[in-house]
Amino acid sequence: DAAQPAASEVEKTACPSGKKAREIDESLIFYKKWELEACVDAALLATQMDRVNAIPFTYEQLDVLKHKLDELYPQGYPESVIQHLGYLFLKMSPEDIRKWNVTSLETLKALLEVNKGHEMSPQVATLIDRFVKGRGQLDKDTLDTLTAFYPGYLCSLSPEELSSVPPSSIWAVRPQDLDTCDPRQLDVLYPKARLAFQNMNGSEYFVKIQSFLGGAPTEDLKALSQQNVSMDLATFMKLRTDAVLPLTVAEVQKLLGPHVEGLKAEERHRPVRDWILRQRQDDLDTLGLGLQGTRGSHHHHHHEFRHDSGLNDIFEAQKIEWHE
């Protein structure tokens, strides 16, 4: 950022006659920094904050206005001021924001709007942290708002933080929101998603659950293989290796449907590579893809179910008909 004198360095000079601001309006854009300091009352500024954003104040004029608010509210701004900060929010430091108590989702939206189109700044991260902690959990409306502004938000949370996400909030999650999630995060999110979507019919269920499957256990993948889901290779490649290894050739063939041919292109990459090495060559040959596994005919299984799955029951109860 440009080097500039701190607002506190603006000389404390008397306001020239006739220049005392009676309201926050456009005429103030022609005031020098020292005139703003001298002629704009901080209390007036606080009560008319909603006007500031509509007026094209310069970068350095905004520094002065921030300084005035800081002097008026040394312990932190009240929410009535915060919700109308507009572009002044860009001037706030994480230290400033830690003094705030933001409880209204509307306030959060207003401030995120200011930063729209930019990466998540330390200021925004601090604001979100303060807001979520104040709420106690990441409820659906908040998650909806945050992922709308920052699709990668969910994946920036630790597994511990994700554990506070209620299953109902999962409805707000879009596939692109999970693009940067690692397996540990998906391990936490998958059971919540399965719970959230459990009453959907089969084909709709798969569409919704697909982006969470990186956290699915073997048992759930086996259940899906019975439902003609035609999982694409991109989704398959994101599955947990330990969940894929126990699957039989027949199960993988059913899981992928017409996409099974894509295994050849991925045979050197995990989890396909590791899965191939676990299969009998005879079984692999049934796919007709020229996949080279181990020559032996013995098939080892190491079941590592981390989740107790009720997926078979769901499908059975709903008597789902799957259509490709």
Epitope: A2, A3, Q4, D25, E26, I29, F30, K32, R51, A54, I55, P56, F57, T58, Y59, E60, Q61, L62, Y87, L88, L90, K91
Partner: antibody, heavy 122, light 107 residues
């Protein structure tokens, strides 16, 4: 693509008024400020004022105060600039241009209209 | 108001030349300075903003530098398309003000 399309050339007698339009397209009208800048024949650029299409707030350079009025119509994404009490030295090309609505660090004029020539002559 | 003074007013140069234009402000404008190119009968076009940031679609032969009260626009290797008039503009404070322009013509 971003476009600012201005109304056509105007000829006015001294003392009359002229109203020029600037129609915006290709961007969110309410997220930008619209400035008016003029250029007399063979001369440099002179800033006249600014309008916020979102709230309608406006500010005029002191030189034009009392003679200029900037308005907007959000339904058609159009901004207007009216200059009254015209004199011969108001003969110039008048441009509208936009700047992003921001924290003050972006008041450079990134897109300009094609200009409207106003000739003041008796 | 902040006065912006450009020099030289006119500059004669040849294709391939390195060209430098100077802009001085009557007071500190920090880095809040833009440069524009204008061709006859056309509207100005943004080249540089925030003293040194290249506007979208502008060739990299254009560069800007400076802060405070003194700024320069440099064209590293003048091309036929670059013969035009160049203006600086400060946006440190209102009213926004422009330099008087520098006309770059063919030597």
């Amino acid at each position: 693509q971003v476009q600012l399309v201005q109304s056509g050339a105007e000829v006015r007698a001294p003392g009359a008024s002229v109203k020029i339009s600037c129609k915006a397209s290709g961007f969110t009208f309410r997220g930008y400020y619209i400035h008016w800048v003029r250029q007399a024949p063979g001369q440099g650029l002179e800033w006249m004022g600014i309008i916020n299409p979102s709230g309608g707030s406006r500010a005029y350079a002191q030189k034009f105060q009392g003679r200029v009025t900037m308005t907007r119509d959000t339904s058609t994404s159009t901004v207007y600039m009216e200059l009254s009490s015209l004199r011969s030295d108001d003969t110039a090309m008048y441009y509208c241009a936009r700047t992003a609505s921001c924290g003050g660090d972006c008041y450079y004029l990134d897109y300009w209209g094609q200009g409207t020539l106003v000739t003041v002559s008796s | 108001d902040i006065q912006m003074t450009q020099s030289p007013p006119t500059l004669s140069a040849s294709v391939g030349d390195r060209v430098t234009i100077t802009c001085r402000a009557s007071e500190n404008v920090n880095i809040w300075l833009a440069w524009y190119q204008q061709k006859p009968g056309k509207a100005p076009k943004l080249l540089i903003y925030k003293s040194s940031s290249l506007a979208s679609g502008v060739p990299s032969r254009f560069s800007g530098s400076g802060s405070g009260a003194e700024f320069t626009l440099t064209i590293s290797s003048l091309q036929p398309d670059d013969f035009a008039t160049y203006y600086c503009q400060q946006y440190q404070s209102y009213p926004l003000t422009f330099g008087g322009g520098t006309k770059v013509d063919i030597k």
